[in-house]
């Protein structure tokens, strides 16, 4: 005889997951950033759409703008002027690339509750902001930067050789947008706006990448793009700043690139002011192993930035690429000259540096064999930063602030046990001077934001709690979810599974591995999320696995650097062992694997698919990488080096899934692309196909028109629901 | 609306010295640049100074370099030339004009005329 | 510094006529940094256009700016009576600011 369960009447009302849930975004959570506008000053636009300003010291909140305003040119985001006499109303979004957007901008001035007229700013416009003090705005339009004093003023015109897809000024072109910046802009404040730095990208000789896009017409459009892939032509960079206040006088000065970056091809990867008359630039070479952190000053009496050699300093990498994914950027200290960064210790795990004069006498602020993952702020006496070093769980991000005011300096865990349960992954933002904070906690709990005092980290007050998601899902049988990891061979495989809520240990099930393994990645993260997987293993009692193996991230330099130079081995590798391991563990059904990824973990499935193990029955390919040598310069020769013989070249020719044709022969394979991908170009699915085709090899296909690297909309729904269908056929699930 | 007035102006001996002012209103005086312009008696037009918002950096023409000196004072929305060691060439309409960006002028005050001569 | 030189000194028109004053620059004008003032005796100038072409706030179509380099042109579509007065070419590319020394349209 067994008990009769207590609340088994409750768990007959608890339903599973249903595709429709994840599609219509039921279970979706929110999170609350303040838009902070001075030390205890923040604003918020409410849920009928008001933006309020809200004052943590006297606790009072007023509406500086009605949602009647907003509504009256449909706008969908704003920004106050730092004097706030004004606020810039941003309507026409029209998304161009990942960051890039353009908008029609209206300036509405707080004082009279107008809008502002005359000299009305031109549309579209490609980015605008505000100075960081005062009221004077800087703009992209058509390529070209202009710069207003005071919103009704006549535009000054600080470039004028912007032309579209050759030359971008204050903007970056499509390869710095996507894979250096990574931003939509490419100008910047100097902190009492007196100077504007820019960037300004010269695409001439980049070969252009060209689409059809079939809208509605008679004939499709084509799209192109000046991008640069492996091996090719790339754009050339120069950085200029201007005295706003009085730019005319000398015009646009531009600053010096380091001698020993100059000498061959180079990027330019962040500019950062220090003080009005200070700024600090990074570059980097070609062969991405090599940065260089140039100060600068600047000269009064010539009116030009002066960059001395002793204000260089090298970061360079000679196991594999410099930094993780991007070089990490300088969080500079009071004394204007000295730096906080992270970069790799001497045991090969990155770690906060203070850097006063040289690298080499860098103090090492942080230690131990985990990372540190950013730095948010450091004031007069505390540098507040995450890592994952908590418990020794790479997966989690927890809020840390070392006191630098005293020696020795002291660490405490602002986060570690604030919900220990709920929170384990967390980021921050971060008033004037630390004064406030919030802290957005993404899980593995349902998320929160709370706002602290800079001081003391006590919790002031709770932001957002999702209690409407808390109540839907109180009658959802959400999967289970377990992180763990495997030791194989010296190397640490930590992976997530999702169990089917009545998982038994005893039974066999389906297992689907998803996968994006791309380096300086990280899929194994304590983060809450009810998705597709989660309705795959709820709904349709699929065990789905995540695993993070050689080339992830924030587990040192040997894990990460391992892939180096050799993309597409050791990431499927690591996923054919765990699957092994998977096995072994009893509860998986061997004759049902599958694996799934999207962008790198399209290139990574459709390998590991290819890899003749005879362990996948079937998988999916979304929007795949096939050959490296048809992806972006930037970012693969980060990895790879350059596609010559006296290179790479033949890792190039060795690692593309359509060498591997012949090895799909025994698999279910469906290979998914968009038609307008400006990212992944549809030309990497196109080969596979040929491939497969020319070696007389069965294979389901499906594009996407004129969608991109996203596939969102419409195609989403259609995309998951195609995609689900082809699982359960595969697994012989009934539908 | 914006207005710009000129006073000080008047009869000077070469190697004397006149302070003009410049009273500003209707517009955000602390935000701009400001410039001196002149024009002798049927001639044309001269730019003489310019002063940044805070006042930090000014400019001259060579022409009056080390004898004149340009200053604001915010909080009184005004702006002032110190002429010293005048010479008869300096005699002209001095305009006061709000300086978009060390570009352009506009807009201009009325003048102010100042006459040096024995 | 930059000498600007306008040209024709008067230009004798009628009202309703068709005004092109031209503006050459020693050196080129960096950036088509130029502006025109129109000016009525007895009075301040009057900002018409900077930027060698955008019209400031204010005034009318008739009048438009063109040019780069050395060579600048302003031109009057239709001119109205009170159009006629001195007009200055102003250049801000390069320091000292200078002014040309003007052009007078007249009452033919």
């Known amino acids: 005889l067994r008990p009769s369960r207590v609340h088994n009447s409750e768990e007959n009302t608890m339903r599973a997951l249903t595709l429709k849930d994840i599609l219509n975004g039921t279970f979706s959570y929110k999170t609350f950033f303040p838009n902070w506008i001075s030390g205890q000053e923040y604003l918020h636009q409410s849920a009928d759409n008001n933006i309020v300003l809200y004052n943590i010291e006297t606790g009072q909140s007023y509406t500086i703008l009605s949602n009647r305003t907003m509504k009256s040119v449909n706008a969908s985001n704003y920004g106050l002027s730092p004097d706030r006499q004004f606020v810039y109303l941003e309507s026409d979004y029209s998304k161009l690339w990942r960051y890039s957007y353009t908008a029609t901008y209206y300036i509405y001035d707080l004082s009279n509750g107008e809008f502002v007229r005359g000299n009305e700013l031109p549309r579209p416009i490609q980015y605008l902001c505000w100075s960081p003090v005062g009221s004077k705005l800087a703009y992209v339009y058509q390529n070209n930067i202009y710069l207003k004093q005071r919103p009704g003023d006549p535009p000054f015109q600080i470039t004028f050789n912007g032309r579209e897809n050759k030359i971008f000024n204050g903007i970056p072109d499509w390869v710095y947008e996507e894979e250096m910046l990574p931003t939509k802009y490419a100008l910047w404040w100097s902190p009492n706006g007196k100077f504007l730095a820019y960037a300004e990208f010269n695409d001439k000789d980049i070969p252009v990448i060209a689409y059809s896009y079939y809208g509605d017409e008679q004939y499709p459009r084509t799209i192109n793009i000046p991008y640069p892939k492996a091996g090719a032509k790339n754009p050339v960079v120069r950085i200029f700043i201007i005295d706003t206040t009085y730019p005319a006088y000398v015009g646009p000065q531009e600053v010096p690139v380091p001698a020993m970056i100059a000498s061959s091809d180079y990027y330019f990867s962040w500019l950062t002011w220090v003080t009005d008359e200070r700024v600090c630039l990074q570059w980097l070479k070609r062969v991405q192993n090599v940065s260089v952190l140039s100060i600068c000053d600047f000269r009064e009496d010539w009116q030009t930035w002066d960059c001395p050699k002793t204000q260089e300093h090298i970061e360079e990498s000679r196991t594999g690429w410099a930094g993780g994914f991007f070089v990490s950027r300088p969080v500079f200290s009071y004394d204007a000259i000295s730096y906080y960064k992270i970069f790799s210790d001497k045991d090969g795990y990155k770690h906060i540096h203070y850097i006063k004069d040289t690298v080499e006498n860098a103090i090492q602020i942080t230690s131990g064999k985990w990372e540190a993952i950013n730095i948010f702020r450091v004031t007069q006496d505390s540098l507040f930063y995450s890592s994952n070093e908590f418990e020794e769980y790479p997966g989690r991000r927890n809020i840390y602030r070392i006191s630098i005011g005293s020696y020795p300096p002291s660490k405490k865990c602002v986060t570690c046990h604030l919900r220990k349960e709920r929170c384990q992954y967390y980021t921050a933002s971060f008033s004037d001077y630390a004064k406030y904070y919030a802290l957005v906690c993404y899980g593995p709990g349902i998320p929160i934001s709370t706002l602290h005092d800079g001081r003391t980290d006590q919790e002031i007050k709770i932001l957002e709690e999702n209690k409407e998601l808390e109540n839907a899902l109180k009658n959802i049988q959400l999967p289970k979810e377990e992180i763990k990891k495997l030791e194989v061979d010296e190397i640490t495989l930590w992976y997530k599974m999702i169990l089917p809520p009545q998982f038994d240990r005893s039974k066999k099930y389906p297992l689907l591995i998803q996968v994006y393994g791309g380096p300086c990645s990280q899929s194994v993260r304590s983060v809450f999320a009810v998705n597709w997987i989660s309705y795959l293993a709820s709904k349709e009692g699929m065990v789905i696995a995540l695993v993070d193996g050689r080339g992830t991230a924030f587990q040192g330099d040997k894990l990460l650097y391992a892939v180096y130079r050799k993309l597409g081995v050791y990431e499927v590798e690591d996923q054919i062992t765990a699957v092994r391991k998977f096995i072994e563990m009893g509860f998986i059904d061997e004759k049902r694997i599958a694996i799934w990824g999207w962008s790198y973990g399209g290139y990574v499935s459709s390998l590991a698919l290819a890899s003749g193990t005879g362990l996948f029955k079937c998988g999916i390919a979304v929007a795949p990488v096939s050959s490296w040598e048809y992806y972006a310069s930037v970012y693969t020769e980060r990895f790879m080096g350059l596609p010559t013989k006296d290179d790479n070249l033949e890792h190039y020719k060795n690692s593309t899934v359509m060498a591997r044709a012949e090895y799909f022969r025994n698999v279910d394979y469906l290979l998914i692309h968009g038609t307008a991908d400006d990212n992944v170009h549809f030309q990497n699915s196109a080969q596979i196909a040929k491939a497969l085709v020319n070696a007389q090899v069965d294979f389901q296909a499906m594009w996407y028109s004129d969608q991109n690297h996203g596939l969102s909309g419409l195609s989403t729904n259609h995309l998951y629901t195609h995609m689900t269908h082809f699982l359960k056929q595969c697994f012989s699930l009934s539908d | 609306e914006v207005q710009l007035l000129e006073s000080g102006g008047g009869l000077v001996q070469p190697g004397g010295s006149l302070r003009l002012s410049c009273a500003a209103s209707g517009f955000t005086f602390k935000s701009y640049v400001m410039s001196w312009v002149r024009q002798a008696p049927g001639k044309g037009l001269e730019w003489v100074s310019a002063?940044?918002?805070?006042?930090?950096?000014?400019y001259y023409a060579d022409s009056v370099k080390g004898r004149f000196t340009i200053s604001r004072d915010n909080s009184k929305n005004t702006l002032y030339l110190q002429m010293n060691s005048l010479r008869a060439e300096d005699t002209a309409v001095y305009y006061c004009a709000k300086d978009y960006y060390g570009g352009w002028f506009d807009p201009w005050g009325q003048g102010t005329l100042v006459t040096v001569s024995s | 510094e930059i000498v600007l030189t306008q040209s024709p000194g008067t230009l004798s028109l009628s009202p309703g006529e068709r005004a092109t004053l031209s503006c050459r620059a020693s050196?080129?004008?960096?950036?088509?940094?130029l502006a025109w003032y129109q000016q009525k005796p007895g009075q301040a100038p009057r900002l018409l256009i900077y930027g060698a072409s955008s019209r400031a706030t204010g005034i009318p179509d008739r009048f438009s700016g063109s040019g780069s380099g050395t060579d600048f042109t302003l031109t009057i579509s239709r001119l109205e009576p009170e159009d006629f007065a001195v007009y200055y070419c102003?250049?801000?590319?390069?320091?000292?600011?200078?002014f040309g020394q003007g052009t007078k349209v007249e009452i033919k």
């Open positions: 050196q080129s004008v960096s950036s088509s940094y």
């Open positions: 002063i940044v918002p805070s006042g930090g950096d000014t």
């Open positions: 102003q250049q801000y590319g390069s320091s000292p600011r200078t």
